[in-house]
């Protein structure tokens, strides 16, 4: 019928609609390295999965160029605040690309969660959520960083996580 | 042309792209039951809608298996707090499935918002946002819980809400 | 083969899947007008882009009717709080439509961030994130407002932003 090539493409695309790139990675005991690197994530167990995206050393890696909604939440908490802690916690999503030598800030939040918890060494909790649409080329990577990561609280993968899907 | 079945499927899928499952439910006076159950939601009035998802007793119910971006925001506020600065609020999205007897934690935040009140004025406001991609089978449900729900403020459906869409 | 019209439509739709409406606008020095109007945004430089959506005086404008996940984050911060500031900051997404004379609240958060300043160091940071699915007709607009906008902190477009994509 003369539509052969396009037809196959359409059929493939219909199937791959169900394979629209998506991922949800969860916090784990190994997430906090203390090395100054990005947070590391669980990719398979529990709620974690990768579909059409790769993972490498804390990074989600695009296999298909396009616009992605990327997101991350981190659970913060403490008893008072560590001595010498600056009053700011920075939680950010950063892009690594062969086109630049340094990571590129994508989405960033700054918070002062310790607030009034300093006086009586009180327990406090706070949460930071980031989400937004960014363009990724094939091979480009996105990582999560938290400064000061001593205040990130991990438990069961539901409180700190990192994900993306193509829009 | 031999492509009949697939063709019909493609045409249907093209139409159903506009029916990609999505929902946005809004807070209402009846949301807070005080019964220990999940929050209840408005499904039709104002900004609320259901498209390809069902609703049952506070839960969004999947009609189609797949990955969904689920989200919820709750507006927190009060005059003082029941446990003072030690008050912790837990806001979470939970899955109900026939495969497990108990609800499964999906996305959870803990906050200590009561420190936000200034010295004399005991009034404070805070907000908690959760969002992430999870897999739902047909018939599986997602609910929102807040502990302590006494601190949730409802007004007009714009401050506390719950939604999802397939990715 | 008798499927001509529909076939062309399908081909076009396949291509336009890559053109699913999406946008991400970023904060800039010109975002805060002090005029009582909505925040203004960068639409082209850096991480900002428009794909199948228009921009006009702070507003994202729908070119295609449907359900959109809209989102905004604002970075808040200060040294103490401005004299006379109410203890509440309101961050909201609002719809403008020819069908109503006034803006319609879509998604709103209220926060009391000033309580986060400790007694000695009065510097504080906080962040507000909003996201949810709303229906937009062709020509309807969405804007971001923050009251009191004096507390919005802009830097490089990563801390305060506004976006949308069709779901």
């Amino acid at each position: 019928d003369g539509h052969g090539g396009s037809w196959e493409q359409l059929i493939q695309e219909r199937r791959s609609h169900q394979n629209n790139p998506a991922a949800h990675l969860t916090g784990a005991n190994s997430s906090l390295t203390g090395s100054g690197g990005p947070l590391l994530w669980e990719t398979q167990l529990g709620l974690a999965f990768l579909r059409g995206l790769d993972y490498h050393d804390g990074a989600l890696v695009a296999n298909k160029a396009g616009y992605y909604y990327i997101y991350s939440k981190v659970q913060l908490g403490g008893v008072g605040c560590p001595l010498g802690l600056a009053s700011t916690i920075t939680h950010g999503l950063y892009k690594r690309t062969p086109r630049y030598p340094e990571e590129l800030e994508l989405l960033v939040s700054q918070q002062s969660p310790c607030g009034r918890a300093t006086s009586n060494s009180r327990v406090w909790w706070d949460s930071s959520f980031l989400g937004g649409v960014v363009h990724l080329e094939v091979g480009e990577e996105v990582v999560v960083r938290v400064l000061d990561e001593r205040l990130v609280r991990l438990r069961d993968g539901t409180r700190s996580y990192f994900g993306a899907f193509m829009v | 042309d031999g492509h009949g079945g697939s063709w019909e499927q493609l045409i249907q899928e093209r139409r159903s792209h506009q029916n990609n499952p999505a929902a946005h439910l809004t807070g209402a006076n009846s949301s807070l039951t005080g019964s220990g159950g999940p929050l209840l939601w408005e499904t039709q009035l104002g900004l609320a809608f259901l498209r390809g998802l069902d609703y049952h007793d506070g839960a969004l119910v999947a009609n189609k298996a797949g990955y969904y971006y689920i989200y919820s925001k709750v507006q927190l506020g009060g005059v003082g707090c029941p446990l003072g600065l030690a008050s912790t609020i837990t806001h979470g999205l939970y899955k109900r499935t026939p495969r497990y007897p108990e609800e499964l934690e999906l996305l959870v935040s803990q906050q200590s918002p009561c420190g936000r009140a200034t010295s004399n004025s005991r009034v404070w406001w805070d907000s908690s946002f959760l969002g992430g991609v999870v897999h739902l089978e047909v018939g599986e449900e997602v609910v929102v819980r807040v502990l302590d729900e006494r601190l949730v403020r409802l007004r007009d459906g714009t401050r506390s809400y719950f939604g999802a869409f397939m990715v | 083969d008798g499927h001509g019209g529909s076939w062309e439509q399908l081909i076009q739709e396949r291509r336009s899947h890559q053109n699913n409406p999406a946008a991400h606008l970023t904060g800039a020095n010109s975002s805060l007008t002090g005029s009582g109007g909505p925040l203004l945004w960068e639409t082209q430089l850096g991480l900002a882009f428009l794909r199948g959506l228009d921009y006009h005086d702070g507003a994202l404008v729908a070119n295609k009717a449907g359900y959109y996940y809209i989102y905004s984050k604002v970075q808040l911060g200060g040294v103490g709080c401005p004299l006379g500031l109410a203890s509440t900051i309101t961050h909201g997404l609002y719809k403008r439509t020819p069908r109503y004379p006034e803006e319609l609240e879509l998604l709103v958060s209220q926060q009391s961030p000033c309580g986060r300043a400790t007694s000695n160091s009065r510097v504080w940071w906080d962040s507000s994130f909003l996201g949810g699915v709303v229906h937009l007709e062709v020509g309807e607009e969405v804007v971001v407002r923050v009251l009191d906008e004096r507390l919005v902190r802009l830097r490089d477009g990563t801390r305060s932003y506004f976006g949308a994509f069709m779901v």
């Epitope: 009586n120 009180r122 | 506020g77 005059v79 003082g80 707090c81 029941p82 446990l83 003072g84 600065l85 030690a86 010295s119 004399n120 004025s121 005991r122 009034v123 006494r150 403020r153 007004r155 | -």
Partner: antibody, heavy 119, light 111 residues
Amino acid sequence: QVQLVQSGAEVKKPGASVKVSCKASGYTFIDHIMNWVRKAPGQGLEWIGRIYPVSGETNYNQKFMGRVTFTVDRSTSTVYMELSSLRSEDTAVYYCGRGSYYWNAMDYWGQGTLVTVSS
Amino acid sequence: EIVMTQSPATLSVSPGERATLSCKASQSVDFDGESYMNWYQQKPGQAPRLLIYSASNLESGIPARFSGSGSGTEFTLTISSLQSEDFAVYYCQQSIEDPWTFGQGTKVEIK
């Protein structure tokens, strides 16, 4: 049933201190705020402050700041109010009042403790 | 601090009659559509007793003849049909701001 039982009447000299106790029973002690209120002869009710038994956190009326201290003994479900540098105008009946479920009212009260300050 | 002013200071009412007590705050005691105003009853030699919380909510165990109304700065306690046990002093109290403050009281006496 909820009960708040206060210690007995006290007579004190000016400049002295007094410590009044309030023992709670019939509910989960740490789940409710405890307030202290006094009523002086011929006067109205006056709020002294509150304590959160769960943490020991306190909020005091500025008028009493530096002279009043609230403490809690969770093992015996008892809160204490100590008032120092007593003067004659501190003569009053002192009440403990439990914070209600919605915490901004006092739904149960102790029977009161009369503190008399006299030389 | 927020000053609470009650009127009248004394109200003489016959049993079975309606009693209306007023309380004014020096600034609004409202937050998010709720009024942080409570009413208490106190009899000689007894502790205060909570009647109404959040301006209009009847405390459990309190007879339905007691009702509260108002918002912002002006509030009213109404006793629809006074019973002999209702003769007492009534206090309003705000809880939106520290320090919590009470009105000076309204004494309801037998006419």
